[in-house]
Amino acid sequence: HKCDITLQEIIKTLNSLTEQKTLCTELTVTDIFAASKNTTEKETFCRAATVLRQFYSHHEKDTRCLGATAQQFHRHKQLIRFLKRLDRNLWGLAGLNSCPVKEANQSTLENFLERLKTIMREKYSKCSS
């Protein structure tokens, strides 16, 4: 069956996000992937969206992330826009109103996005074959 257009949009956004480092991609987020054995796919997407929302809500106006040059400022603003887009699309795929995020483990945002990209690419390869 055909892949959801939202899934393609998520992969495109993740590709853009993982191409660029910013001052704040090394900051840590909750690692929901560390122990996701008994988690449904929809719950994983919902929890990933929750983590991203927590990150951009907290760091959108963080002066350390905005940097000291126009280029750093621009890259951070772009990062936030892409995270918001990813959050929206993940909620769309999840179809859940809310989900708990209680893990203690942390990973950098950069690693979190790479892991999410791997999961999404695997999902895409299954639905496109």
Epitope: K61, A68, A70, F73, R81
Partner: antibody
């Protein structure tokens, strides 16, 4: 609601200077840039320069570098654009805009007429 | 400096028509492109950013596509309020911004 309110129209003599203000409401100054763009009568847009108040950086379009100064007063959330050595070709509507690469909110525009 | 060339410079169309405006960059700009609508005597209004993201509150009949050097703004079904001038703008060379020359959409 974000609003950018610019100062009123100006008529200036060639060789003089003009200073246009742009007062921002909302949280514009805390995490956005303010860019200045002008539009000559019946023409397209020219980006003149911009300022990022929260980090204090200012950048100018090369052709305006010698004549334009962009400043910001964080305490009043107001940005300023001063253009010196005015000539008739500077007659245009000058816009400020909240910017992060693209301009999502614009001021109403300030008409500057340069005439002897 | 990156130059943006819009085509056509003007077009005539009827209400209900599908309208396509193109913007070509002199070098690759990834997806760092925005589209604006301007009506006479008014400030421009942002329609699309990041080449394809619809600005909040903008009707879904507007869409943007493209990446690299070639970009398109499409109005799927032209409405009376859509007669205006449309501009593209690149921000890949941030902080330097450049605009296209504009496309005037007139009533046929």
């Amino acid at each position: 609601q974000v609003q950018l309110v610019q100062s009123g129209a100006e008529v200036k003599k060639p060789g003089s200077s003009v200073k246009v203000s742009c007062k921002a409401s909302g949280d514009t100054f805390s995490s956005y840039a303010i860019s200045w763009v002008r539009q000559a009568p019946g023409q397209g847009f020219e980006w003149m320069g911009g300022i990022i108040p929260v980090i204090g950086t200012v950048n100018y379009e090369e052709r305006f570098q010698d004549r334009v100064t962009i400043t910001a007063d964080n305490s009043t959330s107001t940005a300023y654009m001063e253009l010196t050595s005015l000539r008739s070709e500077d007659t245009a509507v000058y816009f400020c805009g909240r910017e992060e690469g693209f301009l999502d909110y614009w001021g109403q525009g300030t008409l500057v007429t340069v005439s002897s | 400096a990156i130059q943006l060339t819009q085509s056509p410079s003007s077009l005539s169309a009827s209400v209900g028509d599908r309208v396509t405006i193109t913007c070509r960059a002199s070098q690759g700009i990834s997806s760092a492109l925005a589209w604006y609508q301007q009506k006479p005597g008014k400030a421009p209004k942002l329609l699309i950013y990041d080449a394809s993201s619809l600005e909040s509150g903008v009707p879904s009949r507007f869409s943007g596509s493209g990446s690299g050097t070639d970009f398109t703004l499409t109005i799927s079904s032209l409405q009376p309020e859509d007669f205006a001038t449309y501009y593209c703008q690149q921000f890949n060379s941030y902080p330097l911004l450049t605009f296209g020359g504009g496309t005037k959409v007139e009533i046929k």
